[in-house]
Amino acid sequence: NQDLPVIKCVLINHKNNDSSVGKSSSYPMVSESPEDLGCALRPQSSGTVYEAAAVEVDVSASITLQVLVDAPGNISCLWVFKHSSLNCQPHFDLQNRGVVSMVILKMTETQAGEYLLFIQSEATNYTILFTVSIRNTLLYTLRRPYFRKMENQDALVCISESVPEPIVEWVLCDSQGESCKEESPAVVKKEEKVLHELFGTDIRCCARNELGRECTRLFTIDLNQTPQTTLPQLFLKVGEPLWIRCKAVHVNHGFGLTWELENKALEEGNYFEMSTYSTNRTMIRILFAFVSSVARNDTGYYTCSSSKHPSQSALVTIVEKGFINATNSSEDYEIDQYEEFCFSVRFKAYPQIRCTWTFSRKSFPCEQKGLDNGYSISKFCNHKHQPGEYIFHAENDDAQFTKMFTLNIRRKPQVLAEASASQASCFSDGYPLPSWTWKKCSDKSPNCTEEITEGVWNRKANRKVFGQWVSSSTLNMSEAIKGFLVKCCAYNSLGTSCETILLNSPGPFPFIQDNIS
């Protein structure tokens, strides 16, 4: 065994920042630190065969399989994948170890399989086997967490039935409003399923796994807070558990809380109370209303009353199916080049949506914010003043919603020209869409003021580049203008731009750009 080389097999993950495909050893990528693959000598195999731990990667991921060999002298090598030999160029690192790499860019199903590396050193020959598969995320799920009361204890259990099993955490905050943002110092996270401290201002439970993170807030009515202008509304689907917490603080213990549904007291077993003294010796009481599996008849106004506070209500609506309510009519916007502007969509949805903003086939993360009136809003400001079509897409378990936006940036035209033997064409992307003029430059008209009207063909918006309209104008060549300089000008309310073309013979043409504001 001591005669065998010391082999280290590693996997290097790359964060793609290009779209190249293929195998190469020079790549414009950001690499994560190498991950050991526990290369082991395969027992009872003919010849010296090492095997690396099986590698599982996401589709489209870019990786490097690498072997580091601690053996004296030079090494030669050969990669074999699906009976094809692949080029192999070993090099030596700073510790004088032989390094052999196989780069897999943009992993696809066809690139999954066994990669065999044959190495020949001065002392011995050996083989290293890598098995690469694509992670099967089709079976993965991430479900929104829900609450259950812990048996015989005043505590809540947070459950998320997801695959792979999620990490469950409670996110607690004791201040109001903005300071309860996820990364605020006021927020405390507890990575456990059971929560005993149920008196906090804001209580959420989150579950996360490979697919992301889903959270559920414990719906709360605080009798010490001024009621919202619109009645708080809670949506649930048939069969889901209902949890509403009513919270009240008073100078002493001499007060009680009760829940009513449509003026009828909740049945025993559908509520439980907890109380504690706060640091300033005031009494905090909380009363939970809960239904383990709601039915249509659980819909209605739930009112929490106190002997020492004004009562407050919430409207609970039980639906058969989830929904997304928003206006889906497309919207067009016209803004100046430096004007601050955000697209926004206002919607009401249950369950909570997953959403994306898309422009030019590229997706952007989507943030949503709850409004006081039960609606939510998603804004997109990262358009970088690029004109075109922007798409908002939202979905939840039961519904889908798409809304289109067109953004036009008011700007002066910019002209590009091209010419062939029979015609000259000019293109412009300014907005509002420009109008065109063609002028002939001659001895009679050295300033190119002689207008050409014959043989001109204008096409508004002939090419739609992700919603960005391009206007063009074409001049058919006639004997009268052959050999002359012509000038095409595009103009709109923001200015004019021209390009001068020499109409001589086919081939490269000299273009002279001419900007007139």
Epitope: N13, E35, L37, G38, A52, A53, E56
Partner: antibody, heavy 125, light 107 residues
């Protein structure tokens, strides 16, 4: 450099729940098929295997301690957590976590290849 | 559960001696079996896996044999650094089980 590091309380009271965390570095719990086992060793006694979590998130437990153990992992943090309820003085031991690579199509393994240095837990009132 | 019976529980030997430790499984475990060495205050380290395959970096004086239910660890010429406790492990069937250990002491 492959390392596994156990962390958790040094002292636990009887009936309490013990939570131990194994933080790994130099290898991935996500991109390679790697399992992690917990093993313990009471002072002067033999090694005892406790629990294992597979790369596909499946779990398996010691027959005698099954009802008290829960193993979970957080691949993004590179952590494997073991919780043991109803602690008793006989649970006083050094607790180790160890790595198990899975080979071929991820079906076979050769046991633990790298171990953490261990964390000593004393159960006493 | 599969029982692993290791013998002897302890032995005294001198530097240069040939040492043999055996482990018996209560049922057939094929060659899903390994040997570990543990020094006081340290974590165990794998010596052999698959009954007879030497872990990379382990001296060739260590060797293993056996299959099914009977397994042997042999140290051909004991060195000062080999004085430690040795454990066998079966990883054929869950729950995995260790032998009770063999302490190799200086004579």
């Amino acid at each position: 450099q492959v390392t596994l590091k156990e962390s958790g309380p040094v002292l636990v009271k009887p009936t309490e729940t013990l939570t131990l965390t194994c933080t790994v570095s130099g290898f991935s719990l996500r991109n390679a098929r790697m399992g992690v086992s917990w093993i313990r060793q009471p002072p002067g006694k033999a090694l005892e295997w406790l629990a294992h979590i597979f790369s596909n998130d499946e779990k398996t437990y010691s027959t005698s301690l099954k009802s008290r153990l829960t193993i979970s992992r957080d691949t993004s943090k590179g952590q494997v957590v073991l919780t043991m309820t109803k602690m008793d003085p006989v649970d006083t031991a050094t607790y180790y976590c160890a790595r198990i690579p899975y080979y071929g199509s991820g079906s076979h393994n050769y046991g633990m290849d790298v171990w953490g240095q261990g964390t000593t837990v004393t159960v006493s009132s | 559960d599969i029982q692993m019976t290791q013998s002897p529980s302890s032995l005294s030997a001198s530097v240069g001696d040939r040492v043999t430790i055996t482990c018996r499984a209560s049922q057939d475990i094929r060659n899903d079996f390994g040997w570990y060495q543990q020094k006081p205050g340290k974590a165990p380290q794998r010596l052999l896996y698959a009954a007879s395959t030497l872990q990379s970096g382990v001296p060739s004086r260590f060797s293993g044999s056996g299959s099914g239910t009977e397994f042997t660890l042999t140290i051909s010429s004991l060195q000062p650094e080999d004085f430690a406790t040795y454990y066998c492990l079966q990883y054929n069937t869950y729950p995995w089980t260790f032998g009770q250990g063999t302490k190799v002491e200086i004579k």
